[in-house]
C-alpha cells in the first residue's frame, strides 16, 4: 500500500518530492514573520494575520481559501483597572502589590498591545482573606489537605503552583473546596531548569515572567454561550449565568518574585512532605494565614477582567482530491497567541505554512492528492479551543461522514531532545513506517533514522525496540475532531528529556518572553527540529491523503483495548468484596475485546488480499477503516460531559491535558470508597462496563464482512 503512485501526473511527484520541498530556511522566515507583534484572539492584529495567511495560501496554490468567522465569548483585562494582588494590614492598607505587567524582553520595549498576565474568564471580584498553599491544586493535593491535614479551604484564598495538570482543573478543584479566590504562580522547581540562565540569556523563566491561560472547564463545549452549535449570525446565546465552564471565583497568575512575597509569610501547618516544596527560599507552609508577626495581614485580589462576545476568524484552505474529493484529511493548528507566540503557536503555524507551500508547489506542477486535504489556521485556541470547535460544530454533518483524519499542528517544539507523538492506535503503524524513512536531526544519530533516535531516547514502556506513543488527551484543537466526532487524530512535536527535566511544559510557556529569539537562539538555531516536525506532520498528511488503502491498522487498536481492559480491571480488583457483593463482572468487556481482536485480525487478512483495482470494494474497505474510530463514539457522551463521546479515550477528569482510557469506568471507580451510597456507585460501575463492552463489540462488528 504505497502512496508513491501519483494521480494524473508523472511518478516523480511522490512523498519524496513533497518532503524534499520542505525547507528549514522557509520555516525560520515564516516564524519570524508571524512573531513580530502580538496576535491575541479577537484583536485587529490577529484578523490581519488571518487575511495575510489567506492570501499566501492562495498564492501557494490551494484551490480555495476562505475565512470562517464566529462571534464567541472571550475575556480581556480592563485597560483602566489593572488586575493585581495585595497584602493588606489590619487597617486595610496595601503594604505589597504584585506587578501589573512583565518587564518586556530586549527589543520589544516599544511594542503596544501586550496583554498583561491574566487568567482568562476569571470573574471580577475583590476577595480578601487568609491564604492556603495547595501545592499543584490537584485532586490528590486537596485530598491531602482536607482528609489528612484537616485543613478547610472554605472562605480562603488559595495559592497553587502551575504544573502537572491543566490550570482549569486547579480552579475547579479550588472551587469545590470552597475557596473564594485562586492565585496561580510559576515555581522555579517547575519552570527553571538547573544550569540554564533566565531569558534573555537562556530559556529559563525570569522572576517577573508569568504564564497566561484560560481557566475554563468546558469539557469540549466550545464557545461557552453556544454549546453544541456554531456561534454564527443567528445563534441563540445563553445568558452568562448559564454559560458553560466559567469559573465562579476570581483567579490571577503571578511570577515567582511576587509569589516569594506571599509565600515567605505563610504560617499554619508545615508542608506534609517534600513533594509540596518548590525551589523558593520559603517554608512552603500550608497555612491558613500568615505566621505570628504577620497574622493580622490578609491577601486581597483585585480582578476587573471582562467577558465579551468577540469575532474570531479561522482560515480554511482546500486542496481538492482527484479521486475521492469527498474524503477529508485535515491539518490544523492555531494562529492566536497570548503575546508573540514564539513557540505557541507560531512554531507550529510556520510549519503548516511550509507544508501548504510544498503541497502547493506539487499542485502547480499538475499533481493532486487522492483525497481532499483541508488546511486550517484556527483562532481563539487559547480561549478554549473555540475556533476549531465552532467550525467543527458548523460542519459536523460533513465531517462525520467524510472525515478521514485530523493532524494537529500547534507548537512544533517544547524542547529539542526527541520526537513526541500522541495519536489514535490506528496511526501507530503509519507513524512507525514514516519515521523509519526520515533522517534523525539528533546529534549522535547522523545517518540514522528518526525512528531509531526516537526509540532510543523515548522507548515504549511495553514493547522493546519501539518508541513511546501516548494517548490523546486534550488542551488542543484535535479535541472536537477526536473526542466529539470520532475522527482518527494525531499530533507530533519535538520535546524535552522528561527524565532529566522535571519542569512542566517549557519554562517560558505563555509568557511575554516566548519570542522568535527564544527559538532562534536557544531551541533550534538551524531549524532542523522544526523541519523534522514538518516532515512528520506533512508526511502523515501526505500518506493519509494519498495512499490507495488508508494507512490504518485496526490490529493495533485490538492490542491497546486488551491493555486498557486489563488496567481498568486491576483498578476494580482493589475492591474484591464489593465486586462480589454487587456482582460486578468484566466478562462482557473481555469478551468484546476478544471478539474485536479476532475480527480485526480477519479484516487485516482481507485487506491484504482484496482486489484493489475494484473501486467499489476499495471504497468499502477504506470506509470500514475510516468509520472504525467513529464506531467508538457514544451519541449520549460520558456522564456530565456530553461533548466527550469517545468511549475508549477522554481527557482525564482530573487533568484536561492527559488522556484516560475507558474513562466512563475509570471515573465511576475513582475514589469509590468515599461514595456515600455504595449500591448506587457500584451500579454506575456496572453500567459503564456495559456501555464499554457494547461499544467495543459494536465497533468490532463494523469490521466484519459486510455480507
Amino acid at each position: 500500500k504505497s502512496s508513491n503512485e501519483a494521480t494524473n501526473i508523472t511518478p516523480k511527484h511522490n512523498m519524496k518530492a513533497f518532503l524534499d520541498e520542505l525547507k528549514a530556511e522557509n520555516i525560520k522566515k515564516f516564524l519570524y514573520n508571524f512573531t513580530q507583534i502580538p496576535h491575541l484572539a479577537g484583536t485587529e492584529q490577529n484578523f490581519q494575520l488571518a487575511k495575510q495567511i489567506q492570501s499566501q495560501w492562495k498564492e501557494f496554490g490551494l484551490d480555495s481559501v476562505e475565512l470562517a468567522h464566529y462571534d464567541v465569548l472571550l475575556s480581556y483585562p480592563n485597560k483602566t483597572h489593572p488586575n493585581y494582588i495585595s497584602i493588606i494590614n489590619e487597617d486595610g492598607n496595601e503594604i505589597f502589590n504584585t506587578s501589573l505587567f512583565e518587564p518586556p524582553p530586549p527589543g520589544y520595549e516599544n511594542v503596544s498591545d501586550i496583554v498583561p498576565p491574566f487568567s482568562a474568564f476569571s470573574p471580577q471580584g475583590m476577595p480578601e482573606g487568609d491564604l492556603v498553599y495547595v501545592n499543584y491544586a490537584r485532586t490528590e493535593d486537596f485530598f491531602k489537605l482536607e482528609r489528612d491535614m484537616k485543613i478547610n479551604c472554605s472562605g480562603k484564598i488559595v495559592i497553587a503552583r502551575y504544573g502537572k495538570v491543566f490550570r482549569g482543573n486547579k480552579v475547579k478543584n479550588a472551587q469545590l473546596a470552597g475557596a473564594k479566590g485562586v492565585i496561580l504562580y510559576s515555581d522555579p522547581a517547575d519552570y527553571f531548569a538547573p544550569g540554564v540562565k533566565s531569558y534573555p540569556d537562556g530559556w529559563n523563566l525570569p522572576g517577573g515572567g508569568v504564564q497566561r491561560g484560560n481557566i475554563l472547564n468546558l469539557n469540549g463545549a466550545g464557545d461557552p454561550l453556544t454549546p453544541g452549535y456554531p456561534a454564527n449570525e443567528y445563534a441563540y446565546r445563553r445568558g452568562i449565568a448559564e454559560a458553560v465552564g466559567l469559573p465562579s471565583i476570581p483567579v490571577h497568575p503571578i511570577g515567582y518574585y511576587d509569589a516569594q512575597k506571599l509565600l515567605e509569610k505563610m504560617g499554619g501547618s508545615a508542608p506534609p512532605d517534600s513533594s509540596w516544596r518548590g525551589s523558593l527560599k520559603v517554608p512552603y507552609n500550608v497555612g491558613p494565614g500568615f505566621t505570628g508577626n504577620f497574622s493580622t495581614q490578609k491577601v486581597k485580589m483585585h480582578i476587573h477582567s471582562t467577558n465579551e462576545v468577540t469575532r474570531i476568524y479561522n482560515v480554511i484552505g482546500t486542496l481538492r482530491g482527484a479521486v475521492e474529493p469527498d474524503r477529508y484529511v485535515i491539518l490544523g493548528g492555531h494562529r492566536d497567541s497570548w503575546v508573540f507566540g514564539g513557540i505557541d503557536p507560531q512554531s507550529g503555524a510556520a510549519v503548516v505554512h511550509e507544508i501548504v507551500r510544498s503541497f502547493g508547489t506539487l499542485k502547480k506542477e499538475g499533481w493532486r492528492p487522492r483525497r481532499t486535504i483541508l488546511f486550517a489556521s484556527w483562532d481563539a485556541e487559547e480561549f478554549g479551543l473555540l475556533g476549531s470547535t465552532e467550525w467543527a460544530e458548523e460542519n459536523s454533518r460533513l465531517l462525520q461522514e467524510r472525515g478521514v483524519a485530523y493532524i494537529n499542528a500547534d507548537s512544533s517544539i517544547e524542547g529539542n531532545y526527541t520526537l513526541r507523538v500522541d495519536c489514535t492506535p490506528l496511526m501507530y503503524s503509519l507513524v512507525h513506517n514514516l519515521t523509519k524513512e526520515l533522517k534523525s536531526p539528533d546529534e549522535g544519530f547522523e545517518g540514522k533514522s528518526l525512528y531509531e533516535s526516537w526509540t532510543k531516547k523515548s522507548p515504549s514502556p511495553e514493547f522493546s525496540g519501539m518508541p513511546r506513543i501516548s494517548k490523546l488527551g486534550s488542551g488542543n484543537d484535535f479535541e472536537v475532531f477526536f473526542q466529539r466526532l470520532g475522527i482518527a487524530s494525531g499530533r507530533a512535536r519535538y520535546t524535552k528529556n522528561w527524565e532529566t527535566n522535571k519542569f512542566s511544559g517549557y519554562p517560558l510557556y505563555h509568557s511575554v518572553y516566548e519570542t522568535y529569539e527564544l527559538v532562534e537562539k536557544f531551541y533550534d538555531p538551524m531549524f532542523k527540529y522544526h523541519l523534522t516536525v514538518a516532515q512528520v506532520r506533512g508526511g502523515m498528511v501526505f500518506e493519509l491523503a494519498n495512499s490507495i488503502v488508508l494507512p490504518f491498522d485496526c490490529r493495533d487498536y485490538a492490542v491497546v483495548l486488551r491493555k486498557y481492559a486489563d488496567k481498568i480491571y486491576s483498578i476494580s480488583m482493589k475492591h474484591p468484596q464489593e465486586m462480589k457483593t454487587y456482582s460486578v463482572s468484566f466478562d462482557s468487556l473481555f469478551s468484546a475485546v476478544k471478539n474485536f481482536t479476532e475480527i480485526a485480525s480477519k479484516f487485516s487478512e482481507r485487506l491484504q488480499d482484496f482486489d484493489k483495482s475494484n473501486p467499489i470494494v476499495l471504497r468499502m474497505m477504506n470506509d470500514q477503516l475510516m468509520f472504525l474510530e467513529r464506531a467508538f463514539i457514544d451519541p449520549l457522551g460520558l456522564p456530565d460531559r456530553p461533548f466527550y463521546r469517545h468511549v475508549i479515550y477522554a481527557p482525564s477528569s482530573h487533568n484536561k491535558y492527559a488522556g484516560e482510557s475507558f474513562p466512563g469506568i475509570y471515573d465511576a471507580l475513582f475514589d469509590i470508597e468515599s461514595k456515600v451510597d455504595p449500591s448506587k456507585a457500584w451500579g454506575e460501575v456496572k453500567r459503564q462496563i456495559y456501555v464499554a463492552a457494547f461499544t467495543v463489540q459494536a465497533a468490532a462488528e463494523t469490521l466484519s464482512e459486510v455480507a
Epitope: R147, D148, K150, N152, S154, G178, K574, H575, P576, Q577, E578, T581, E673, S674, V676, D677, P678
Partner: antibody, heavy 116, light 107 residues
Framework: EVKLEESGGGLVQPGGSMKISCVAS????????MNWVRQTPEKGLEWVAE??????????HYAESVKGRVIISRDDSKSSVYLQMNSLRAEDTAVYYC???????WGQGTTVTVSS | NIVMTQSPKSMSASAGERMTLTCKAS??????VSWYQQKPTQSPKMLIY???NRFTGVPDRFSGSGSGTDFILTASSVQAEDPVDYYC?????????FGGGTKLEMK
C-alpha cells in the same frame, strides 16, 4: 451485604478499661475509614473516633470528650476495628456503634456501662 | 464545634399526612448533611445524604433539601411504619455532630 457486628461491651467500674470490637463483612474493609459513634438518652448521638485506611496512613481523629482516653485501631487482615477505652467515666455509658465512613452503615451496637 | 439543632423535638401526624422536619447548623456545612431514621431497639439507618440524595432502598416518599445552614427532611405521606426517631448529622468537619432528634408519633 454490608454487615458490622460489635462485641465486647459490658459493665466496668469507673477508672477501668474496656476494649470493644467490630467485625465487618460484605465490603473490602481495608479501603474504608471506620468510625465509632455512641448514643445515650441524655446526649443523643455522639461521634467518638475515626480511623482511616492504609492509603491515609491509618490516621486517627477523636472527639474532645474522649481524647487521651481512647484509642481506635484496626486489623485489616481480620476486617476488624477496635476501640480501647481507658479511665472510663460514668458519662461514657452508652450504646457504641461501629459505622462505616459517612455513617452510611451501622452495626447493631454494643452497650458499655460504667458504674460502681 | 458545629451544633445541629433539630425542630420540632416531637410531632404527631396522621397516616397520609405530610411531615416536615428541619435541621439548622450553627455554621455553613455546605451540603454535607445526612438524615437518619432509628426504630426502637435498632441502630440508625441512613435515609438521605448530601442534603438531598436518597440512600439506596429508601422509599421515595422521603426527600431532603437545603444547603449552607438550613436543611429539611420531608415525608410526603406518612405511613404507619414511619413513627420513629429522626436525626440529622453533619460530616463537613470534625467533630462530626448530630442533631438532638425528632420523635414522630401517629395521631
Amino acid at each position: 451485604e454490608v454487615k458490622l457486628e460489635e462485641s465486647g461491651g459490658g459493665l466496668v467500674q469507673p477508672g477501668g478499661s474496656m476494649k470493644i470490637s467490630c467485625v465487618a463483612s460484605g465490603f473490602t474493609f481495608s479501603n474504608y475509614w471506620m468510625n465509632w459513634v455512641r448514643q445515650t438518652p441524655e446526649k443523643g448521638l455522639e461521634w467518638v473516633a475515626e480511623i482511616r485506611s492504609q492509603s491515609n496512613n491509618f490516621a486517627t481523629h477523636y472527639a474532645e470528650s474522649v481524647k487521651g482516653r481512647v484509642i481506635i485501631s484496626r486489623d485489616d487482615s481480620k476486617s476488624s476495628v477496635y476501640l480501647q477505652m481507658n479511665s472510663l467515666r460514668a458519662e461514657d455509658t452508652a450504646v457504641y456503634y461501629c459505622t462505616r465512613r459517612w455513617n452510611n452503615f451501622w452495626g447493631q451496637g454494643t452497650t458499655v456501662t460504667v458504674s460502681s | 464545634n458545629i451544633v445541629m439543632t433539630q425542630s420540632p423535638k416531637s410531632m404527631s401526624a396522621s397516616a397520609g399526612e405530610r411531615m416536615t422536619l428541619t435541621c439548622k447548623a450553627s455554621e455553613n456545612v455546605g451540603t454535607y448533611v445526612s438524615w437518619y431514621q432509628q426504630k426502637p431497639t435498632q441502630s440508625p439507618k441512613m435515609l438521605i445524604y448530601g442534603a438531598s440524595n436518597r440512600f439506596t432502598g429508601v422509599p421515595d416518599r422521603f426527600s431532603g433539601s437545603g444547603s449552607g445552614t438550613d436543611f429539611i427532611l420531608t415525608a410526603s405521606s406518612v405511613q404507619a411504619e414511619d413513627p420513629v426517631d429522626y436525626y440529622c448529622g453533619q460530616s463537613y468537619t470534625f467533630p462530626y455532630t448530630f442533631g438532638g432528634g425528632t420523635k414522630l408519633e401517629m395521631k
